[in-house]
């Protein structure tokens, strides 16, 4: 029924997924050494890793096992929703001599999330 | 002092690290299809990912950024303690014809944990 569908949709929305997160370097005190950009879209991962773990939750065998163990023993934590794919961004920063340096920073932007 | 040392050790012990977890396949209902072994040492990851993230917490640049953002905006979650290195185990299982098959299962055992 439509009611069941909306409940499912709401429940599904609570599952592990990528969320928007714009990081302004001035908010975290990095604007004194990062010249450009002034911030970037980092994203973050958040949400439930429920039993049983569905395929789209991009999990490992260990996460499947741990989720199963948690279902019979809650003292063992569920798997956690974390970045499973990350990409790089380029930034201009000031080195110790106040020189502007262009550097590629690895693993800065979340491209995908999963239960691990 | 010894008291301070034990407090530090206890606090340090709360940080993200690997914990023992023996999975007995009969406890999770897998003994009907897994022939051997009867269980295995899977380990699991658990603990805090505090600000600032120390080197030994094996984090990504994104985790460092997210931890920093969490320190100024608690609505963004901290990084999560998860397996960062996993290894395989071999298991004997029964296939659909009740034949015993030896298979290598990837990503079954936690070798290392980190904040992600």
């Amino acid at each position: 029924s439509p009611k069941h569908h909306s409940q499912r949709a709401r429940k599904k929305n609570k599952n592990c997924r990528r969320h928007s997160l714009y990081v302004d370097f001035s908010d975290v005190g990095w604007n004194d050494w990062i010249v450009a950009p002034p911030g970037y879209q980092a994203f973050y991962c958040h949400g439930d890793c429920p039993f049983p773990l569905a395929d789209h939750l991009n999990s490992t065998n260990h996460a499947i096992v741990q989720t199963l163990v948690n279902s019979v023993n809650s003292s063992i934590p569920k798997a956690c929703c974390v970045p499973t794919e990350l990409s790089a961004i380029s930034m201009l920063y000031l080195d110790e001599y106040d020189k502007v340096v262009l550097k590629n920073y690895q693993e800065m932007v979340v491209e995908g999330c999963g239960c691990r | 002092s010894p008291k301070h040392h034990s407090q530090r050790a206890r606090k340090k012990n709360k940080n993200c690290r690997r914990h023992s977890l023996y999975v007995d396949f009969s406890d999770v209902g897998w003994n009907d299809w897994i022939v051997a072994p009867p269980g295995y040492q899977a380990f699991y990851c658990h603990g805090d990912c505090p600000f600032p993230l120390a080197d030994h917490l094996n984090s990504t640049n994104h985790a460092i950024v997210q931890t920093l953002v969490n320190s100024v905006n608690s609505s963004i979650p901290k990084a999560c303690c998860v397996p960062t290195e996993l290894s395989a185990i071999s298991m004997l299982y029964l296939d659909e014809y009740d034949k015993v098959v030896l298979k290598n299962y990837q990503e079954m055992v936690v070798e290392g944990c980190g904040c992600r």
């Epitope: 001035s26 020189k99 502007v100 | -």
Partner: antibody, heavy 121, light 108 residues
Amino acid sequence: QVQLQESGPGLVKPSETLSLTCTVSGDSISSYYWSWIRQPPGKGLEWIGYIYYSGSTRYNPPLKSRVTISVDTSKNQFSLKLSSVTAADTAVYYCARICSSTSCWGWFDPWGQGTLVTVSS
Amino acid sequence: EIVLTQSPGTLSLSPGERATLSCRASQSVSSSYLAWYQQKPGQAPRLLIYGASSRATGIPDRFSGSGSGTDFTLTISRLEPEDFAVYYCQQYGSSPLTFGGGTKVEIK
């Protein structure tokens, strides 16, 4: 296209605070760094500082103790305050845009037409 | 800070001639982060060149920039009457951002 217009008093007394505003039209103030540059009569150019729409600033060290640059995104404006002025602060004051991307950061384009501020009693 | 020295202070040339303006930095300008501007009397500076050699939008191809490290050059291949002005270099490879003292190109 984007246009910048400086406004503010043309005469300021010594020891007082110089206040100027730059109004940006034709573009959102939220996508770039916004800068102030000055030019004493018959002399060269001096960068004062810049601001991002979030309020993040960077100032020229010799002026840092006297300079405040602020932004009002609702009005698409940014402002300069220079305290404890002397005759040496007499100059044409320009506002200008700096690209905030790594691929185009650092040069000034476009500029406002400039406003002359004289410090005199 | 990086000090930029422009030479000559004044360049007296006739229309149609070639103008060569020099900008020397007190230390190496990283990644050729150098720009050139033209300023006419009573007007704001106008961006000509960025990245040492890239022409800004709408700038005629008689203007060209070259150089790296500490030595940079702005060349105007054939001077037009509207090119007589003051030219400034600016570095953005180090903080603070700094300008040269300018070169005046005047009619001979």
